[in-house]
């Protein structure tokens, strides 16, 4: 039987969870486990390296499990913070999975959404002109430059366990 270590499909490097403070943050962890007799499959989250139970954030985790007809298993744990704060958006959210074949972990890419900017340009006659909230950069005619949004406030670290690091036979 071709049993393999757990495979974390989500979170991954291709999907970013971008939220404004006050919004709900939902991060799914979905893990594929190949069938292995008597293996105890586990999935868990850490936030800044700690289990959610050990921190003061109001976080809930909901789990669902589905099986294929060959008894492979997919476990999904959705981490939810109802009203996320700017501090929460700077934390490290890592999904972990373990079976008898090995352990893997993957960080979610979480960042704070920059609100639609409003720029004020001083006109030569002393009046102010305020840019709209389209979220697009508004050229500043005095500087001849585009005013751009802030850099990413936070990009979660990436944790990958390649097979050449971690062999389980």
């Amino acid at each position: 039987k071709n049993a393999v270590p757990p495979v974390i499909h989500s979170p991954n490097d291709h999907v970013v969870y971008e939220k404004e403070p006050g919004e709900e943050l939902l991060i799914p962890c979905t893990v594929y486990f190949s069938f292995l007799m008597d293996s105890r499959n586990e999935v868990w989250w850490t936030i800044d390296g700690k289990k959610p139970d050990d921190i003061t954030i109001d976080v809930t985790i909901n789990e669902s499990i589905s099986h294929s007809r060959t008894e492979d298993e997919t476990r999904t744990q959705i981490l939810s913070i109802k009203k996320v704060t700017s501090e929460d958006l700077k934390r490290s959210y890592v999904c972990h999975a373990r079976s008898a074949k090995g352990e893997v972990a993957k960080a979610a890419k979480v960042k704070q959404k920059v609100p639609a900017p409003r720029y004020t340009v001083e006109l030569a006659c002393g009046f102010g002109a305020t840019g709209g909230g389209s979220g697009k950069p508004i050229p500043n005619p005095l500087l001849g430059l585009d005013s751009t949004g802030l850099n990413d406030i936070f990009e979660a670290q990436k944790i990958e366990w390649h097979e050449h690091h971690h062999h389980h036979h």
Epitope: N2, V4, P5, Y32, E163
Partner: antibody, heavy 118, light 107 residues
Framework: EVQLVESGGGLVKPGGSLKLSCTAS????????MSWVRQTPEKRLEWVAT????????YYPDNVKGRFTISRDIAKNNLYLQMSHLKSEDTAMYYC???????????WGQGTTLTVSS | DIQMTQSPASLSVSVGETVTITCRAS??????LAWYQEKQGKSPQLLVY???NLADGVPSRFSGSGSGTQYSLKINSLQSEDFGSYYC?????????FGGGTKLELK
């Protein structure tokens, strides 16, 4: 330039066997998972098999599990698909693809055709 | 398993038009979606991944959007080289599966 060249397709009777090959060039073969994806005569795409970068782990959907075996020869930059107990529904164009496992396929070969018919 | 439903199955359009192709997942796939283009006689090519990210070398007239179960691929000002078939694919879990495809034909 990434290149993937498949070979080995042909006409096989139901219940028969066939081995497909793919030769890779233009990238470090041992750094990537590789997959076979097929396109049915109705133009549907189906994932068939994946092998991990070092070749230790293989993955299959339920409909080919136990009948198909994916393997690779890292020294030769070759990928293989051994198919047995073939059925008419395995008739398809078989593509070799570089795989950003477990996500998407970023480069595909030109394909080789398998026809399963009596 | 997740099923992907693409619409429309085919579309007759003219050069210069704007086209939107949609893909619906049978369950929430949280933006774990890719789009591919297949031109006549050629193999599929990656266009978009993570629902919105353009693959290297893909022209900016292509854009991906969506969330949850509903996703779309938009092509602004269609060029003659854009005709062909387009497929979505989820990577939310194993098995990864594809939509049935959308064929863009010249009107």
């Amino acid at each position: 330039e990434v290149q993937l060249v498949e070979s080995g397709g042909g006409l096989v009777k139901p219940g028969g066997s066939l081995k497909l090959s793919c030769t890779a060039s233009g990238f470090t073969f041992s750094n990537y998972a590789m997959s076979w994806v097929r396109q049915t005569p109705e133009k549907r795409l189906e994932w068939v098999a994946t092998i991990s970068d070092g070749g230790n782990y293989t993955y299959y959907p339920d409909n080919v599990k136990g009948r198909f075996t994916i393997s690779r020869d890292i020294a030769k930059n070759n990928l293989y698909l051994q198919m047995s107990h073939l059925k008419s529904e395995d008739t398809a164009m078989y593509y070799c693809a570089r795989d950003r496992w477990p996500y998407f396929f970023d480069f595909w070969g030109q394909g080789t055709t398998l026809t399963v018919s009596s | 398993d997740i099923q992907m439903t693409q619409s429309p199955a085919s579309l007759s359009v003219s050069v210069g038009e704007t086209v939107t192709i949609t893909c619906r997942a049978s369950d929430n796939i949280y933006s774990n979606l890719a789009w591919y283009q297949e031109k006549q006689g050629k193999s599929p090519q990656l266009l978009v991944y993570g629902a919105t990210n353009l693959a290297d070398g893909v022209p900016s007239r292509f854009s991906g959007s969506g969330s949850g179960t509903q996703y779309s691929l938009k092509i602004n000002s269609l060029q003659s080289e854009d005709f062909g078939s387009y497929y979505c694919q989820h990577f939310w879990t194993t098995p990864r599966s594809f939509g049935g495809g959308t064929k863009l034909e010249l009107k």
